[in-house]
Interface confidence: low
C-alpha cells in the first residue's frame, strides 16, 4: 500500500498590534496536540497594513475596511480555508489609541466599533478588539521574549537554540519602544516591588514569577518628540527652532495645531505668537541630549528610587532584550552588535547626527525622508532612555541585547497575548507522556 | 455606563454555603481587578479576597480554604464562592473594581451589595 | 501584615469647621493609600488615592497627604453632606489583605 501524507493537525491565531504610528498582522501556528508545551508556536507571517494608526482614522472611520482589507486577504491566504472558522483573531489596541481615549472615549469607541465590525465580516472566529492597558503591554512583551527563548521550560539543554541562550532559566527582562508609549518589564532580584500598579504575579509552568513592569505614556520616541518640540519652542525666541537633534541643514515646518494636537504636549502648551515655526537642524548629539533630559522629571521619587517622574523602578536584574522601536532604530544605526559598547554608540551617534542633512540624504537614498530625518532624534532618545531613564551603566549596557526576531518570530507584545488568550501557557507544569517530544529530534 | 452589580445574597443555614456574582459591564476584566469588601451590620469595611487582570488571586488569611474568588471574563462576571457559613459573616458583600492588579490607587468603582444573611 | 490604625473613631464637629482624620500604617505603604466616604446604607465612596490625589468628581476641599506610614485625610471646612463614616486603605500589598482598611472613623454633628 501507498504510504498517504496525513493532513497536518495544526492551528493558527491572528493577532493585529494597532500601534500609534502603524497596524501590523501576525499570524501564529503551533501543532494541536502540543498546545501547552512551551516554545511551540511560532509565527508564520507578518503583514503590515498600508498607512498610519488607527487612531488617525477618527475624522475618517469609514474608511478603517478598505485599510485592513490587504492583510486580512492575506491572512486568508495563508491559513488553509479548512482552518478559518477556528482562527481566532484578536486585535490590541496599544499608547496611540489609549492617547484617543483620554481626549474622548466616544471617538475611542467609534474607532474601535468600525474595526470591529470590519473583522467580523471575514470568515475567522473573531475575538474582539480592545486597547490593552500599558501593563499589559508589558507583561505579553515579558511572557513573549521568554516564550521563545525557552526561559518557561524546565528540561535544561546542552545546546543553544537561540543566540541569546545562556542556558539558565533566568529570565530576560523586556524593552519595548513603540511610538507612543515605552515599557520596561523585568523579574527584580529579591526587591519589594513598593508600588502595586508595577507589580505582577504569575504563575507559568509550574514556577511563580514576581515580575516589576512600567508603561510610560507619551514617553513613545515620536510622543518624545513632540513632547521635545513643544518644550523647546516655548523658549524659542522666534519662530525659528534649532533644533541639535535633526542634522545640519536640516528644514522642517511644523504647525503649532499639530504640535499641541497630542495630549502628551499639554503640559508644555502657551499661546505662541505664530501658526507655524521652522525647525532648522544644528546636529549636535550633546545638546540633543540635554534637550532630551528635561522630559524626565528625576528631582522628585517617592520610592527608595525611581525611573522619572516619581514612578518606582527597582535595580536593574539580568539581561534584557530590547525591540520594537529599540531594535528597528539601533539596526539602521548598525549599532545592535553585541560587542559595541555603550561608549562606542555614543562616539558613533556624535558622528550621525553632526553630518550633514544632504550628505545622509544622498547616502540613505532608499529611505523615506520622514523616518530618515528622525533617526538622529531617536537614538539620542533610546541612549537617553536607557542610560538616564532607566539608569543603566556603561557596564550594564552589555546586558542589553536589541532583539528583531527569535527563532523566526518577532519580540512583542502579540505572541504572548495571543497565548494568554488561548489559554496556552499553563499555570502548571504539563505532564509529559511517553513518547510526547519524540519530534523534536 | 461602568457598573458592578452582586447578586447571589440570601439567607442561608449556618454550615452552608452560597456563591456571589458581580456581575461587571461597561469595562473588561482583562483590565481591572476586581475585590470583595463585607460589611457586618454595624461595623467597618473587611476586605475578602482579590482577583487582578491576569486571573491571580489573593485572600485575607480568614478567608483561605473557606472562600473562592474566580472569574468568567465571557461572561463579565467575578464570582465568591463561600462555604462553612457563620452567624459572625452576615453581612453587605460589595465587589469592587481597582486598577490593572489591584488597588493601588483605590477602589474608585462599587456595587450597591447584596447582603447575605446567615441564620437557623 | 498591615495594620491600619484610624483616629479619632468618632468626631463631633460643626459646618464650617476645619476637620482632619489621620491613619497610621504598621509598615511602610509608600504612597499607596487611599481614602473613602461611607454613608449609612450606601456603598463607599473613593475620595483619595495614591495619598493625596483627588479622586473624579470630588470636590476640592478635600484633601490628602503623608507617605510611608502616616496619612491624613483634611476637609478645609465641612459641609452638611460631609457627615458620614470615613476609611483609609493600604494599596500597597495584596498578599496580606487582611487589615487593608482602617477602623473607619465617624464624622458627627456637633
Known amino acids: 500500500t501507498q504510504n498517504k501524507a496525513l493532513p497536518e493537525n495544526v492551528k493558527y491565531g491572528i493577532v493585529l498590534d494597532a500601534g500609534s504610528s502603524h497596524t501590523s498582522l501576525y499570524i501564529y501556528k503551533w501543532p494541536a496536540e502540543k498546545e501547552n508545551d512551551t516554545g511551540v508556536v511560532h509565527q508564520v507571517e507578518e503583514c503590515r497594513v498600508k498607512g498610519p494608526g488607527i487612531s488617525k482614522f477618527v475624522q475618517k472611520v469609514n474608511e478603517i475596511g478598505i485599510y485592513l482589507t490587504d492583510c486580512m486577504e492575506r491572512a486568508r491566504e495563508v491559513i488553509p480555508r479548512s482552518q478559518h472558522q477556528e482562527t481566532p483573531v484578536y486585535l490590541g489596541a496599544t499608547a496611540g489609541m489609549r492617547l484617543l481615549r483620554m481626549e474622548s472615549e466616544e471617538l475611542a469607541d467609534r474607532v474601535l466599533d468600525v474595526v470591529e465590525r470590519s473583522l467580523s465580516n471575514y470568515p475567522f472566529d473573531f475575538q474582539g478588539a480592545r486597547i490593552i492597558t500599558g501593563q499589559e503591554e508589558g507583561a505579553y512583551g515579558w511572557i513573549t521574549i521568554n516564550y521563545l527563548l525557552g526561559k518557561f521550560s524546565q528540561k535544561t539543554r546542552w545546546f543553544s537554540i537561540v543566540p541569546y541562550e545562556t542556558n539558565n532559566q533566568e529570565t530576560f527582562g523586556a524593552l519595548d519602544l513603540g511610538g507612543a508609549s515605552t515599557q520596561v518589564t523585568f523579574v527584580p532580584q529579591n526587591q519589594t516591588i513598593e508600588s502595586p500598579d508595577n507589580a505582577l504575579q504569575f504563575r507559568l509552568y509550574g514556577k511563580d514569577y514576581n515580575v516589576y513592569t512600567h508603561s510610560f505614556l507619551c514617553y513613545g520616541k515620536d510622543q518624545a518628540l513632540w513632547q521635545k518640540l513643544a518644550k523647546d519652542i516655548q523658549v524659542a525666541s522666534n519662530e525659528i527652532l534649532r533644533d541639535p537633534c535633526f542634522h545640519p541643514g536640516y528644514k522642517k515646518v511644523v504647525n503649532v495645531s499639530d504640535l499641541y494636537k497630542t495630549p502628551c504636549t499639554k503640559r508644555f502648551e502657551m499661546t505662541l505668537p505664530f501658526q507655524q515655526f521652522e525647525i532648522q537642524g544644528i546636529g549636535n548629539y550633546q545638546q540633543c541630549h540635554q534637550s532630551i533630559l528635561e522630559l524626565f522629571n528625576t528631582s522628585y521619587c517617592p520610592y527608595s528610587q525611581c525611573a522619572f517622574n516619581g514612578i518606582f523602578l527597582p535595580p536593574l536584574q539580568g539581561d534584557f532584550g530590547a525591540f520594537s522601536a529599540f531594535y528597528f532604530v539601533m539596526k539602521f544605526l548598525n549599532l545592535t552588535s553585541e560587542k559595541v559598547s555603550q561608549e562606542k554608540v555614543t562616539e558613533m551617534m556624535k558622528k550621525f547626527c553632526a553630518q550633514p542633512w544632504e550628505e545622509i540624504k544622498t547616502s540613505y537614498a532608499g529611505v523615506k525622508e520622514k523616518y530618515l530625518s528622525e533617526y538622529c532624534f531617536s537614538g539620542t532618545y533610546i541612549l537617553s532612555l536607557l542610560l538616564q531613564g532607566y539608569h543603566f551603566t556603561a557596564d550594564s549596557w552589555e546586558h542589553i541585547h536589541f532583539i528583531g526576531k527569535i527563532q523566526g518570530s518577532d519580540a512583542g507584545w502579540t505572541l504572548g497575548y495571543m497565548l494568554n488568550l488561548t489559554n496556552m501557557i499553563p499555570a502548571e507544569q504539563p505532564l509529559s507522556t511517553p513518547l510526547s517530544h519524540s519530534t523534536y529530534v | 455606563e461602568q457598573q458592578l452589580v452582586e447578586s447571589g445574597g440570601g439567607l442561608v443555614q449556618p454550615g452552608g454555603s452560597l456563591r456571589l456574582s458581580c456581575a461587571v459591564s461597561g469595562f473588561s476584566l482583562s483590565s481591572y481587578a476586581i475585590s470583595w469588601v463585607r460589611q457586618a451590620p454595624g461595623k467597618g469595611l473587611e476586605y475578602i479576597a482579590i482577583?487582578?487582570?491576569?486571573?491571580?488571586?489573593y485572600y485575607a488569611s480568614w478567608a483561605k480554604g473557606r472562600v473562592t474568588i474566580s472569574k468568567d471574563s465571557s461572561k463579565n462576571t467575578v464570582y465568591l464562592q463561600m462555604g462553612s457559613l457563620r452567624a459572625e459573616d452576615m453581612a453587605v458583600y460589595f465587589c469592587?473594581?481597582?486598577?490593572?492588579?489591584?488597588?493601588?490607587?483605590?477602589?474608585?468603582?462599587w456595587g450597591p451589595g447584596t447582603l447575605v444573611t446567615v441564620s437557623s | 501584615d498591615y495594620q491600619m490604625t484610624q483616629s479619632p473613631s468618632t468626631l463631633s464637629a460643626s459646618v464650617g469647621d476645619r476637620v482632619t482624620i489621620t491613619c497610621q500604617a504598621s509598615q511602610n505603604i509608600y504612597s499607596n493609600l487611599a481614602w473613602y466616604q461611607q454613608k449609612p446604607g450606601k456603598r463607599p465612596k473613593l475620595l483619595i488615592y495614591r495619598a493625596s490625589s483627588l479622586a473624579s468628581g470630588v470636590p476640592s476641599r478635600f484633601s490628602g497627604s503623608g507617605s510611608g506610614t502616616e496619612f491624613t485625610l483634611t476637609i478645609s471646612s465641612l459641609q452638611p453632606d460631609d457627615f458620614a463614616t470615613y476609611y483609609c486603605q493600604q494599596g500597597f500589598s495584596s498578599n496580606n489583605v487582611d487589615n487593608t482598611f482602617g477602623g473607619g472613623t465617624k464624622v458627627e454633628i456637633k
Open positions: 482577583i487582578n487582570s491576569y486571573g491571580t488571586t
Open positions: 469592587a473594581r481597582g486598577d490593572s492588579y489591584g488597588s493601588g490607587v483605590g477602589l474608585g468603582l
